[in-house]
Every structure is written in C-alpha cells, then in structure tokens.
C-alpha cells in the first residue's frame, strides 16, 4: 500500500533517528569532558560537536551557562545540568503533547512525529481528513481534532462500514402522516392532501386553504372544502373569464337589429302608464280635432292616444283592446265605449286617423271608417276666450280606473307619420330626434326584448290547496321559456325572497361550470346558490331554444329544447333544496323576468341580466310583461328585434 | 312650410287710410285664425286681436275697436287689417301671427308712418 | 284683463353672465305664460311656450320657471346673439297681453 509522502516521512524519521543513536551518546560523553570538566573553547567545543551549526547554537547557551552557575570549576550541579541539556533540543519538549508521538532532536534543531491525525511543526494542527475526498464518508463528514466520523442526512442512517448511508422509511410508521396520505422520498418523506387542502404538521391532518386570501379572484370570491370560485358582477355586466378568477365584459354574440328609426316614436317607454307624449292645442278660432298616424304593434292591449279636457269633462281615448280598436268617450259626463274593426296588432304598418266632425267621430283604418260615433259636444272647450285641447299619446293624463271601460293603458306600439289638427308638429319631431328612448326598433317581430339592462317582476303564487279540506297545500314551479338569446350570460327566470334577500330559485344562461371549472355554455337551475341541474345549450346560434323547468314535492328537472339536463345533486341533496325551496314559496316572493334586483354575487349562480328575445310561461300562464308589478323601461313587452342578417 | 308676408311700408298722412295684408302660405288657411299686434317705434308689443278665417269674424280689443278692420279674402289665403283717418300716434310696425293660443310664426311686419 | 309687469326694463350685462327676467302677472294665469326675443327690424321669436316648453331649436340656456303670477325667464350664461328685447305673454285669457319689455344690452 502507498503512504502519502507527509506519513512516509513520519515512518521513516524513527528508523533515521535509531542510526545515529550510538554517536549522539559518544558525543555526550565527550562533551562532558572538553566541557562540563573543562572550560571549552568555540573551538573545542567545534571538535565534540564536528559541525557548525550544532557548534553555533551550543556555544552562546555555553556562555549564558557559566554567567549563570559560573565556570566548571565551581562544581556548581545547575552547570552541569545546564549544560548537558544544550545539545538535546526535545528538551524541554517542544512539540504539542497531544499531536505527538515523539521529539526527535537534530542538529541545532528538533523534529515532532505526530499521530495519525495531527499535522504541522509542533503536531499542534489538526489534520482536516474531510476535505479531502470528504474523508471516504458517502453524506457528512465530520471532522474532530486528530480524528473524523461519517454521518447521515436526516431520514438516513450510517451504514455498518461507517461511511454508507440508506434511506428510512417514515412511512413504515403509520402515524407519520397521521390522516393524510404518507409518501416516503429519498432521505424523506412528504404527507400529501387532496388538492385545495394543505398538510397541518401539527395536527397531523389535511386542512382546507382559504385560496380567496391569496387574492386570486378579481372581484367576489367564495371558499369552499378543497376549493373556491370566484364570482363577478353580473349587473355591471361583468362574467368570469376564461382563467376563472378574472372578470370580463358580457358582451353580445348574437347581433340584433336593434337599429332605431328617427322618425318613428315609441308607446311603450313609460311602464307607469304615463303618456310619451303630452301636447296642448290652444286656439282662439273654434277647430275641431283631426289626428292621423301610421301605427304598428303586437300588443293585443292599451291606449294609443286621448283628447279633451279633465277627466270629469269631454275626451275620448282611442285604445286596443284584444288586437282591436276601442273608443272610449265622455261627453258632459255621459260614458260610452265602442268597438269595432279588424285586428290590428298584427306588427304591419297601417295608417289610423281621428276625426271630429259636426256631430260625429269618425274612425279610420287604412283610409276606411272603422267607427262612426254620434256625439253632442266639442273636444275643444272653451275657456276665458280660448279652446283648449290637451292631447296625449301612449297613456292618458289620469288614473286608468277613471275611464268608463278600466284598460291595462300599456301598449308596446310605434307610431310614424303623425299630424296633429293638420299643423306640421316639429316638437315632437326634434324631440324624438334627440331621444332614442322615444324612438321604436326599425324592425320587430313577436316575443319581448330584453336589453341587458333591468328587469321585470311579478307577484305570484305558487302554493296551491287542493280541494279536500284539511289537506296540506302543495307546491309547484312549472317554466317554460322560449328564448333567442343576444349573450350568453343572464338570468331567465328568478324568485326573489325580499324579506330573507335570497334567491329561492334561479334558471339561467352561463358560460361555465363552476365546480369543474370548465367553460362549457350552459343552462343552470339553482336553488339559492347551488345549482340542481346543469344542461348544454347552442346559446349563441341565433335560433329560438325552448328551456322548460319543473319543479315540485320531490322532483326538478331541466328540459333545453326537450333533451333533459344533468342533475348535480344526490337524492338526499335535491330532497334538501327543494325543502329550503318550500320554505321560501311558503312566505312573500316576487317572480324576476330577465335579471335579478341588486342582491349578492353569491346569491344565485348567475346575477346578470339577460340579453334576448324571450316569452315566459308560469305553471301554465303566459306572462304579460305589460302586467308585470315593474318592468325596465328598456324592455319591449310585445315586440323583439330580428336577428341582423348574416353579412355575405 | 309655414310663411306669412306682410305689404311692404306705407307713409301716410293725418287724416288718411291705410291697408296692409298678410298673405299665408304652407298651411290650411282656414284651419288658424290670425292675429294682429302692433308695435309703436321704441315701444312694446299690444295685441290688437284677431280674425275667425272661417267665418270671416274679427274681434278686437278695446283699444282697436272703432278705425281698426280685420278682413280676409280667403281665395288668395290673405289677411287685411285696415287704418282708417290716420293719427301720428298710429305709426307703428304691425304685424300678423298665427292663431295657436301664441304667436309661433309671425309676419314680417308692415312700418306704417303718419306723418304731414 | 289680465296685466303683466314685466321687470327689469333693462339691464346691461357682459358675455357668459347669467339674465334673470321677472314677469308678474294681475291674476292667476295657471303656467300659461311664455317667452319672446325680439331683435331690431324682425318679428318676435318664440323661445319658450306654456308650460315652461323649451321650443325646438331654443339652445338651452334659455329656461323660465313659475306659475300662478310669478315667472321668471333665465338666461344662463349670456352670449353675444342673445342681446336683444325679452317680451313675457300670458295665454290664460282674452284679452292676450304682453309685458312691456326688457332690453338687455352689453356692458
């Protein structure tokens, strides 16, 4: 075996040291007699030693010897000892006591043999065995003054040679991760939890993470066990983003012609009743009233114009009633109503005028007398010295129920081409030119228009008795919605629990699944906020899609275009949200078309409102928005505007 | 569209008569009735009254009853207002206005000046 | 006869200043009042009809309030066209009578 030269050398030193060992005590003995006896000279002293360097350092000590004990004639015993110990450099020892194993004297100088583990002159420095090839050890080398020891790595244990090392394995103890799942890794081991939860070390359990205090939602955000969603302000127009944590614009993905004709002046803005139109003739000369309009509507009912005086004293009021025009009038307090013509709510433009002529009221559709109505009177009464008229279009200028025949006097209609006592009307004209509120939808077809932007609700009741007294009372939801859908976000239908601020019941259009986390364009209904029943829908294709909902004791289902949805929910699941359902239909709620009133994002699935055509069954009932307790002003009752056309 | 235009200016001594017309046009003549108002140099406005186009009836007020006549010859869809024996304090701008319970469109006006 | 008295007669005021006319009328004339202008040489404009109408083509500067006797016509910040006479008319009853005028003139 080769020895590294430092420990050769080491070897080799004592075997040196033996070799001179009979003249280094023939030359003591000869030093004792030219020196110790005797006074020597340098030069005496040159012959015992037979070298310079050994003569050079004996010498000056010699001297400082004999100042000390005085010459050797004293006899003093200190000189003797004094100078007998000059030659021998080991003494006193000079080397480090526990790096040593032996001094050996040389000329004028001294050599320390150290122990394995010890290094320099002295055999005072520690020789560092681990930094060279980390002293053999596989993972820690420690080193110690004159020795060194291998260890391990946390989670590895020294094998029997002292220098290997092998992995433990923690997961052999079934308490290292306690409930979690134990995976043992190199020198390791990691508990695992399902995703959404974090290891406790010192409950030794999975908890869930609170992922909404990272802020990783833009705007509302839910936690729940193992996960989260965020939710966005479904009014403000706001849907979640593809990332499911961002917010983004619900914006159109069908077009709709929603184009607005200047020239035409929409009935239906004012959902009070109140007319769109109030106008005052005033005249010295007697003149009688002559109103003439192009007209168009879908809407079976309301009052498309009166004219007179207050309501105790002379008007009419020209309306719709069941698609046909009805005349309603007072003269000198006496009522009457007529009827009579074709129906009219056809949506096609047709031309209606007013006449007042010398005894009579003349009504004409297309040019043709509709009615001819024999009246005592004028419409243009007389007042201080002039003729009053007040005219209004779209309602009347008091309460419905003071007319002789009560008429819902809402009318989703458009009008165009009016002339009023033959006068050019720019009022009305430059009015409506700077109002598109005022101005009607260039096209339209049947259904009801929702914008986007409001909604309108109901107060309904859904809790039926049966027949047999003393029965319980039951419940159902029955909702059939067709809808030709603009977005793809928005509520269709909703119940609303003013009292609790919670939405029993919700059906809507989202574009995602909330618990996969998938975009997927879907119809979701949902108790509060959990959704029962999920089902696919093409919402963006422009066609008309019919979604029907039923609900009552036990069961919920999902119909879109008659393919049924996927419940989300077990058996004991539904049996719970269809008794929290109950509970709520047992105190006040108000039924939401299109939208929902200002609640918590968290609420209901989706908050936003619907954007589309669509036209509401309830357990059975068509809803007349006309009807509604309210509805937005932006939404049409009666009429919707077409899909635009594909460009070529 | 609606246009009344007045007779152009007139210089009149004391003593004289004056008739001024207002021809109608862009609307049924006999549909409005037609004001007078006349306006003294510097001063405001009065309102004189009015003529019924159907009937062909004047009314004035009570400081135009007596030398001021309202006329029409409503084949040519015009007014008249005429000035009879002429003072100094007649010279005025007169005007003629529609009848809609207010003045929406209004002649030109015709400058009458009395003056020896 | 209902009479009008119409106040200030006039009033001189720089471009962007605010105008505030008063017409008080004899008896109570409901809100059957409205607003003339009148420049040299042309026939009165009507600016605002009863019930307070702003009529089309009025800039909206121009506004009145009141009704029963007291009405007031505003100009809110006056520009250079709008230096002229201001007449008030009542409609409530025969005979029609008009205030006596206000001229507003530049400072």
């Known amino acids: 075996a080769l020895l590294p030269a430092r420990e050769a050398t080491q070897f080799l030193r004592p075997r040196q040291r033996r070799a001179f060992q009979v003249f280094e005590e023939a030359k003591q003995g000869h030093l004792e007699r030219e020196c110790v006896e005797e006074l020597c000279s340098r030069e005496e002293a040159r012959e015992v030693f037979e070298n310079d360097p050994e003569t050079d350092y004996f010498y000056p000590r010699y001297l400082d010897c004999i100042n000390k004990y005085g010459s050797p004639y004293t006899k003093n015993s200190g000189f003797a000892t004094c100078v007998q110990n000059l030659p021998d450099q080991c003494t006193p020892n000079p080397c480090d006591r526990k790096g040593t194993q032996a001094c050996q004297d040389l000329m004028g100088n001294f050599f320390c043999l150290c122990k394995a583990g010890w290094g320099g002159r002295l055999c005072d420095k520690d020789v560092n065995e681990c930094s060279q090839e980390n002293g053999g050890c596989l993972q820690i080398c420690h080193n110690k003054p004159g020795s060194f020891h291998c260890s391990c790595h946390s989670g590895f244990e020294l094998s029997s040679d002292g220098r290997t090392c092998q992995d433990i394995d923690e997961c052999a103890d079934s308490e290292a991760c306690g409930e979690a799942r134990c995976k043992n890794l190199p020198g390791s081991y990691s508990c695992l939890c399902d995703e959404g939860f974090a290891y406790s070390s010192q409950e030794k359990a999975c908890r869930d993470v609170d992922e909404c205090l990272q802020g990783r939602c833009e705007q509302v955000c839910v936690n729940s066990p193992g996960s989260y969603t965020c939710h966005c302000d479904g009014r403000g127009g706001l849907k979640l983003s593809q990332d499911m944590d961002t917010c983004e614009d619900i914006l159109p993905c069908v077009p709709f012609s929603v184009a607005k004709s200047v020239k035409s002046l929409y009935l239906g803005r004012m959902f009070s009743g109140t007319p769109v139109i109030r106008l005052r003739f005033k005249r010295l000369q007697p003149t009688r009233l002559v109103a003439e309009f192009d007209f168009r509507t879908f809407d079976p009912e309301g009052i498309l114009l009166f004219a007179g005086g207050h309501q105790d004293s002379t008007w009419i009021v020209l309306a719709l009633r069941a698609g046909r025009l009805e005349l309603q009038l007072r003269y000198n307090g006496v009522g009457r109503v007529t009827s009579s013509g074709p129906v009219i709510n056809h949506g096609m433009w047709q031309t209606i005028s007013v006449e007042e002529l010398a005894r009579n009221l003349v009504i004409k559709v297309n040019r043709d007398a509709v009615m001819k109505i024999a009246v005592a009177g004028d419409l243009f009464q007389p007042e201080r010295g002039l003729y009053h008229l007040n005219l209004t279009v779209g309602g009347i200028p008091f309460h419905e129920k003071d007319l002789v025949q009560p008429i819902n006097p809402r009318l989703d209609g458009c009008m165009r081409s009016w002339n009023w006592l033959n006068g050019e009307d720019t009022t009305i004209q430059e009015t409506v030119k700077v109002n598109t509120r005022m101005q009607c939808f260039s096209v339209t077809e049947r259904g009801s228009f929702y914008p986007g932007s409001g909604f309108a609700f109901y107060s309904l009741d859904y809790m039926r008795t049966p027949l047999d007294v003393g029965t319980e009372s039951t419940w159902e939801v029955e909702v059939v919605a067709h809808i030709r859908p603009a977005a793809d976000t928005g509520v269709l239908f909703a119940l609303w629990a003013p009292d609790l601020r919670a939405v029993p019941l919700s059906v809507a259009l989202v574009d995602y699944h909330s618990t996969k986390k998938l975009k997927k364009q879907l119809v979701v209904l949902a108790v509060e906020h959990t959704a029962l029943a999920l089902m696919e829908i093409k919402v963006c294709d422009g066609q008309e899609h019919v979604v029907t909902v039923s609900l009552r004791d036990g069961e919920a289902t999902l119909e879109v275009d008659g393919t049924r949805g996927q419940s989300e929910v077990s058996a004991a699941q539904l049996q719970e949200r269809l008794a929290v359902l109950e509970r709520h239909l047992r105190s006040p709620v108000l039924t939401f078309a299109g939208g929902l009133p200002d609640v918590p994002v968290t609420s209901a699935p989706v908050t936003a409102f619907y954007r589309g055509c669509m036209t509401l069954e309830v357990n059975r009932r068509l809803l007349d928005l006309d009807e509604a307790a309210y509805k937005h002003s932006d939404i049409t009752a009666h009429s919707c505007p077409p899909v635009e056309p594909a460009a070529a | 569209q609606v246009h009344l235009v007045q007779s152009g200016s007139e210089l009149k001594k004391p003593g004289a008569s004056v008739k001024i017309s207002c021809k109608a046009s862009g609307y049924t003549f006999t549909n409005y009735g037609m004001n007078w108002v006349r306006q003294a140099p510097g001063q405001g406005l009065e309102w004189m009254g009015w003529i019924n186009t159907n009937t062909g009836e004047p009314t004035y007020t009570e400081e135009f009853k007596g030398r001021f006549v309202f006329s029409l010859d409503t084949s040519v869809t015009t007014s008249y207002l005429q000035i009879s024996t002429l003072k100094a304090e007649d010279t005025a701008v007169y005007f003629c206005?529609?009848?809609?319970?207010?003045?929406?469109?209004w002649g030109q006006g015709t400058l009458v000046t009395v003056s020896s | 006869e209902t009479t009008l008295t119409q106040s200030p007669s006039s009033l001189s005021v720089s471009t962007g200043d605010r105008v505030t006319i008063t017409c008080i009328t004899s008896?109570?004339?409901?809100?059957?009042m409205n607003w003339y202008q009148q420049k040299p040489g042309k026939p009165p404009k009507l600016l605002i009809s009863?019930?307070?109408t702003l009529r089309p083509g009025v800039p909206s500067r121009f506004s009145s309030s009141g009704s029963g006797t007291d009405f007031t016509f505003t100009i809110s910040s006056t520009q250079p066209e709008d230096f002229a006479d201001y007449y008030c008319l009542q409609t409530d009853s025969v005979p029609l009578t008009f205030g006596q005028g206000t001229k507003v003139e530049i400072k």
């Open positions: 009863e019930g307070n």
């Open positions: 206005a529609r009848d809609e319970g207010w003045f929406v469109y």
């Open positions: 008896t109570d004339i409901d809100d059957d």
